[in-house]
């Protein structure tokens, strides 16, 4: 089996208030089966940004069609950026578990920061 890797190519993403930010994440394997989630921050207080299996995330859309059975692109777009959105975003692979899924591997993170407004 190829070992799964989580790839977040940008260490830093400069964004503009009011615009849409794209956070990239790809995986190198579909296995083990389980969902990919996005969080801002780390540890017990991290904020869930997107969960592919459930929930309502009105400002978040996926770049790819996650219903494709061979999908390896879990990149997301966050619309209407505000200063409150700054932080480091992690895509995290979970493997299935009972009763709860188990965190399997995290990407290295992408720091979202505000760039200068265009003049």
């Amino acid at each position: 089996e190829e070992e799964l890797q989580m790839i977040q190519p940008e260490k830093l993403l400069l964004v503009t208030v009011g615009k849409t930010a794209t956070l990239h994440c790809t995986v190198t394997s579909l296995l083990p089966v389980g969902p990919v989630l996005w969080f801002r921050g780390v540890g017990p207080g991290r904020e869930l940004i997107y969960n592919q299996k459930e929930g309502h995330f009105p400002r978040v859309t996926t770049v790819s069609d996650l219903t494709k059975r061979n999908n390896m692109d879990f990149s997301i777009r966050i619309s209407s950026i505000t200063p409150a959105d700054v932080g480091t975003y992690y895509c995290v692979k979970f493997r299935k578990g009972s009763p709860e899924n188990v965190e399997f591997k995290s990407g290295p993170g992408t720091e979202m920061a505000l760039g200068a407004k265009p003049s």
Epitope: E1, L30, L31, P32, V33, P35, Q52, K53, E54, D65, L66, T67, K68, R69, N70, K96, S98, P99
Partner: antibody, heavy 118, light 107 residues
Framework: DVQLVESGGAVVRPGESLRLSCAAS????????MSWVRQAPGKGLEWLAG????????YYIDSVKGRFTISRDNSENSLYLQMNSLTAEDTAVYYC???????????WGLGTLVTVSS | ALTQPASVSANPGETVKITCSGG??????YGWYQQKSPGSAPVTVI????KRPSDIPSRFSGSASGSAATLTITGVRVEDEAVYYC???????????FGAGTTLTVL
């Protein structure tokens, strides 16, 4: 309420073609992958084909690959199964089913009966 | 191929377990589907190994471990008499597979 209603079942002769339809309502059809499952008389359930939400990716069981084509029209909230070169072994009730995020099924239609007989 | 017993029987109020083996835990999710008569629409009782739809009674539960999944009906009722099919989705092959079905008889 999620509703899936199949239609198009009929009695056909071996070698003929048939197109089944599944009308979906009560959910955002364009956000869900869909599948076709059949049940031959006195037999169990058999998954046939699946299609991604956008319709670009399709998946088939080997026994129908090349003969059956799954497709969808998201503007019409409809799923289709084009069946060619039918044989008596294709006689079955055909169900459409909505897929969960991990490609199992949560909602099913009532089914439509296809009979292939000379 | 997924393997499940052809039949099980129980008295009302008893606990019934139906097993489904043959999948690979690393690559397979399981679901369970109830069919009360041949040709009638199946009803999903469990998906994603252990997730129960909101309209399914809490006496139905699912679990998966190793290469097998289990459907448990705690306090079985006469109305639970049906054929129960397990299904697997294999993330290696992108294919869905059904077991042959288990006929539950409530005595």
């Amino acid at each position: 309420d999620v509703q899936l209603v199949e239609s198009g079942g009929a009695v056909v002769r071996p070698g003929e073609s048939l197109r089944l339809s599944c009308a979906a309502s009560g959910f955002t059809f364009s956000s869900y992958a869909m599948s076709w499952v059949r049940q031959a008389p006195g037999k169990g359930l058999e998954w046939l084909a699946g299609i991604s939400a956008g319709g670009s990716d399709t998946y088939y069981i080997d026994s129908v690959k090349g003969r059956f084509t799954i497709s969808r029209d998201n503007s019409e909230n409809s799923l289709y199964l084009q069946m060619n070169s039918l044989t008596a072994e294709d006689t079955a009730v055909y169900y459409c089913a909505r897929e969960t995020w991990n490609h199992l099924f949560d909602y099913w239609g009532l089914g439509t009966l296809v009979t292939v007989s000379s | 191929a997924l393997t499940q017993p052809a039949s099980v029987s129980a008295n009302p109020g008893e606990t019934v377990k139906i097993t489904c083996s043959g999948g690979d835990w690393y690559s397979t999710y399981y679901g369970w589907y109830q069919q009360k008569s041949p040709g009638s629409a199946p009803v999903t009782v469990i998906h994603s190994d252990d997730k129960r739809p909101s309209d399914i009674p809490s006496r139905f539960s699912g679990s998966a471990s190793g290469s097998a999944a289990t459907l448990t009906i705690t306090g079985v009722r006469v109305e639970d008499e049906a054929v129960y099919y397990c299904a697997g989705y294999d993330g290696r092959t992108y294919i869905n597979t059904f077991g042959a079905g288990t006929t539950l008889t409530v005595l």
